[in-house]
């Protein structure tokens, strides 16, 4: 399996009530808003054939999916959470930025592109989707990356 | 309550095909993983092979050309064939749950396990 | 494959012992390591996944700890219910693989 490195985050970052509050508040109303319950995106089959030691890699690349290509573009939603997670994401994913795998990584951004595909092809309740998944996102960060 | 209960004949002929049954309860088999793990009188655990929540499924390669893992969701029963059986495969058979959708490779909860004994 | 090589593979201890059993990784699984208890005729019980984190329901007598390639299991005051075997696994990839077994009898 591919060595990773750097691929760590301090567990004082999934410690803090507020903010651990704030993302499942917004997960919590964003999934009442989606009306497809039989996708999804965080689940077994996004760590199929992903050593453990490879999924922090792994979770930060759907992390800078979901701040890129959905929190950005929504926004304007889901107010006021949503001006308080993003930020708090966002940091995350910053601390992230040197987290690398040496060798091939081919196995893992397949999977991350299926979920990409999903989110896409799905569109708009695609995105809202990806939101109400963010109580998964934060505790597989903090599963894979702690 | 999580419950899994592994059934099947517990005498298998040589060169046959071993078939056994896993029936759960107290979960979805379209949730959980669900593996089988074997182990002989006196030895450790060998891990054998998974099917996934999605109906997919993962063998460990020293079985790959003999075994199959398929279920019935509608029974809620992951099942178990192992061909071309010898006298090695005489053991006690397990399934496991997973123990969520992360830790998918942690056995969370167990069958109480069924004996196989392959003789003529 | 990942072979998993514990010791000692058997141990007598008396209630209120404390014990500790370790388990060798033979390439580095990070902290993937889970710890289960086997008795007769009960189905396997994990106790410990992640190296250190405690299955619910696992009594807090009960540690692991190590990372990379050397694990161990610690039973802080043996129970009489703890006398059994003990199996360590690793859970980092395929195919998952378990040592040999640390049965523990009473003294």
């Known amino acids: 399996a591919p060595i990773s490195s750097h691929c760590r985050l301090d567990k004082s970052n999934f410690q803090q009530p507020y903010i651990t509050n704030r993302t499942f508040m917004l997960a919590k109303e964003a999934s009442l808003a989606d009306n497809n319950t039989d996708v999804r995106l965080i689940g077994e089959k996004l760590f199929h054939g992903v050593s453990m030691s490879e999924r922090c890699y792994l979770m930060k690349q759907v992390l800078n999916f979901t701040l890129e290509e959905v929190l950005f573009p929504q926004s304007d939603r889901f107010q006021p959470y949503m001006q308080e997670v993003v930020p708090f994401l966002a940091r995350l994913s910053n601390r992230l930025s040197t987290c690398h795998i040496e060798g091939d990584d081919l196995h893992i951004q397949r999977n991350v592109q299926k979920l990409k595909d999903t989110v896409k092809k799905l569109g708009e309740s695609g995105e809202i989707k990806a939101i109400g998944e963010l109580d998964l996102l934060f505790m597989s960060l903090r599963n894979a990356c702690i | 309550e999580v419950q899994l209960q592994e059934s099947g004949p517990g005498l298998v002929k040589p060169s046959q095909t071993l078939s056994l049954t896993c029936t759960v309860s107290?979960?979805?088999?379209?949730?959980?993983?669900v593996h089988w793990v074997r182990q002989h009188s006196g030895k450790g655990l060998e891990w054998m092979g998974r099917?996934?929540?999605?109906?997919?499924?993962s063998y460990n390669s020293a079985f790959t050309s003999r075994l199959t893992i398929s279920r019935d969701t509608s029974k809620s029963q992951v099942s178990l064939k192992l061909s071309s059986v010898t006298a090695a495969d005489t053991a006690v058979y397990y399934c496991?749950?997973?123990?969520?959708?992360?830790?998918?490779?942690?056995?969370?909860?167990w069958g109480q396990g069924t004996t196989v004994t392959v003789s003529s | 494959d990942i072979v998993m090589t514990q010791s000692p593979s058997s141990v007598s201890a008396s209630v209120g012992d404390r014990v500790t059993i370790t388990c060798k990784a033979s390439?580095?699984?990070?902290?993937?390591l889970a710890w289960y208890q086997q008795k007769p005729g009960k189905a396997n019980k994990l106790l410990i996944y992640?190296?250190?984190t405690l299955q619910s329901g696992t009594p807090s007598r009960f540690s692991g700890s190590g990372s990379s390639t050397d694990f161990t299991l610690t039973i802080s005051s043996l129970q009489p219910e703890d006398f059994a075997t003990y199996y360590c696994?690793?859970?980092?990839?395929?195919?998952?693989?378990f040592g040999q077994g640390t049965k523990l009898e009473i003294k």
């Open positions: 496991a749950r997973s123990l969520d959708f992360y830790y998918d490779t942690t056995l969370a909860f």
């Open positions: 107290g979960f979805s088999l379209t949730s959980y993983s």
């Open positions: 099917m996934w929540s999605d109906g997919d499924t």
């Open positions: 390439k580095t699984i990070s902290k993937y």
């Open positions: 992640s190296g250190s």
């Open positions: 696994q690793q859970h980092n990839e395929y195919p998952l693989t």
